[in-house]
Interface confidence: medium
């Protein structure tokens, strides 16, 4: 999930070909994808941007959210984890339940029409008893977000109804404290588990990462880091990747960040994942939910 990645459109083309051949699960949105003009930056939104239909508000350079070298999450441990789906069941981004009727995700995950799946453990569309399905009825990107660039990469999504709280579906609090270097966090998602190859997991993946210092973050991504972002990673080649975008980074029991962007391929040495720094946005989140409820 980095910013300065080599061209990745060939990955999309290969994926789309594979999808058409029925080789892989329906994970990517692939309408109207052009294989021209490869981009060098890759947000972690992964699949979402991979195949934005014409006219949709998607960033074609955002394909870096993913969990590399993580492990299967324990069931019921991430009840705030949401999947954003295009028809029929194509996951394009992760999201996080922060209120009974509101999700947070990355602004670069914006689509016009999508569904939301909560309480689901596997990537496949097979019915699970704890799942709850919703429509996204309103998407509100942060006003400071603009493409290109990765600042203020967050968006609120209003669901068509309130969730029914269960052991599989419940909100998480957004941290008002900014992360410190060395803080241990957990990132989760259904993004690709390999990079630059693409391989999607059967079930939700979890990965322990550590918040890195601002200096290391700035050094990894010169002139691209500001205080709306933080870096986190793992020296052993573990990272989030394509498809994880918008998903949660949980530290000390509260939501600290969202998968935003990173380097491509994912999990490169000294190229940590970059996450939306939610402590900077607690006021905006609260006020926006109140104003639109």
């Amino acid at each position: 999930m980095a910013t300065a990645r080599p061209p990745w459109m060939w990955v999309l083309c290969a994926l789309i070909t594979a999808l058409l051949l029925g080789v892989t699960e329906h994970v990517l949105a692939n309408n109207d994808v052009s294989c021209d003009h490869p981009s060098n930056t890759v947000p972690s939104g992964s699949n979402q941007d991979l195949g934005a239909g014409a006219g949709e508000d998607a960033r074609s350079d955002d394909s870096s959210s993913r969990i590399i070298n993580g492990s299967d999450c324990d069931m019921h441990t991430q009840p705030w984890q949401a999947a954003l789906l295009l028809r029929p069941n194509q996951l394009y981004c992760g999201a996080v339940l922060v209120h009974p009727q509101w999700l947070l995700t990355a602004a670069h995950c914006r689509k016009k029409v999508f569904r939301v799946r909560l309480g689901h453990y596997s990537l496949s569309p097979v019915y699970e008893s704890g799942q709850q399905m919703f429509q996204g009825v309103k998407s509100i990107p942060h006003p400071g977000y603009s493409h290109p660039g990765h600042s203020n990469d967050l968006m609120l999504i209003k669901l068509n109804r309130r969730i029914r709280p269960t052991k599989d579906v419940r909100p998480i609090n957004v941290s008002s404290h900014c992360p410190s270097a060395g803080t241990k966090c957990l990132v989760s998602g259904w993004g690709t588990t390999k990079s630059p190859q693409v391989h999607f997991p059967k079930v939700l993946q979890c990965l322990n990462i550590s918040v890195l210092s601002q200096k290391r973050c700035e050094d990894a991504y010169p002139r691209q880091i500001d205080d709306t972002m933080f870096c986190a990673g793992d020296k052993a080649g573990r990272d989030s990747c394509q498809g994880d975008s918008g998903g949660p980074v949980v530290c000390n029991g509260s939501l600290q960040g969202l998968v935003s962007w990173g380097d491509y391929p994912c999990a490169r040495p000294n190229r940590p994942g970059v996450y939306t720094n939610l402590c900077k946005f607690t006021k905006w989140i609260q006020e926006t939910i109140q104003a639109n409820s």
């Epitope: 410190s180 270097a181 060395g182 200096k215 700035e218 050094d219 990894a220 040495p269």
Partner: antibody
Framework: VKESEGGLFKPTDNLTLTCTVS????????VTWVRQAPGNGLEYIGF???????YYASWAKSRSTITRNTNLNTVTLKMTSLTAADTATYFC?????????????WGPGTLVTVSS | NIVMTQTPASVEVAVGGTVVIKCQAS??????LSWYQQKPGQRPKLLIY???TLASGVPSRFKGSGSGTQFTLTISDLECADAATYYC????????????FGGGTEVVVK
């Protein structure tokens, strides 16, 4: 890692010091400039990362510029409007940001004296 | 703005003794702290990085500990050659800070 010769400067003069490195690439390591006034402690001036971005101490920001030339393996510190308070030994040091080893190789330092 | 406060400013210890130098950061810096030794007229030398990792060639008599905001350098079995000034240095951020170094601790060996 070695700093260029310092010397005697007058107040309001501009200072240019060059740090020449060998045995490693500036594309893989940062360089930090530090100074030490006579009898005083170490004082951070600024840092240039492996990606080429420069960052500065708050007191140095308005009158310091750090640049690099990866082909020549040099890092340059420019400081404008010198005053007597800038009299110090100036050090450059390799900054191993990625490896976490911080300032692991230091130059011998060069003395800069500012006096009218 | 992260401020590094180092104590004591000076300490006198007998050969074979132990000296403890403390460094406090004004905010959490994780383990992004290193320690340097500087002898008069010489360049600083890296002793400890990542708060507790011994740099290459440094004797195990030097020990770093701590994380977050409180850090300690302990020198045991003090030798005459350990007489020097010791500095802590935060490596958490390099931008817009007043100084990344502590004020220094002069160790005098009796």
């Amino acid at each position: 890692v070695k700093e260029s010769e310092g010397g005697l400067f007058k107040p309001t003069d501009n200072l240019t010091l060059t740090c020449t490195v060998s045995g490693f690439s500036l594309s893989n390591y940062g360089v930090t400039w530090v100074r030490q006034a006579p009898g005083n402690g170490l004082e951070y001036i600024g840092f240039i990362g492996s990606g080429g971005s420069a960052y500065y101490a708050s007191w140095a920001k308005s009158r310091s510029t750090i640049t690099r030339n990866t082909n020549l393996n040099t890092v340059t510190l420019k400081m404008t409007s010198l005053t007597a308070a800038d009299t110090a030994t100036y050090f450059c040091a390799r900054d191993d940001v990625g490896g976490g080893k911080s300032l692991d190789i230091w130059g011998p330092g060069t003395l800069v004296t500012v006096s009218s | 703005n992260i401020v590094m406060t180092q104590t004591p400013a000076s300490v006198e210890v007998a050969v074979g003794g132990t000296v403890v130098i403390k460094c406090q950061a004004s905010q959490n810096i994780g383990d992004y702290l290193s320690w340097y030794q500087q002898k008069p007229g010489q360049r600083p030398k890296l002793l400890i990085y990542s708060a507790s990792t011994l740099a290459s060639g440094v004797p195990s008599r030097f020990k770093g500990s701590g994380s977050g905001t409180q850090f300690t350098l302990t020198i045991s079995d003090l030798e005459c050659a350990d007489a020097a000034t010791y500095y802590c240095h935060q490596d958490y951020t390099s931008n817009d800070v007043e100084n990344t170094f502590g004020g220094g601790t002069e160790v005098v060996v009796k």
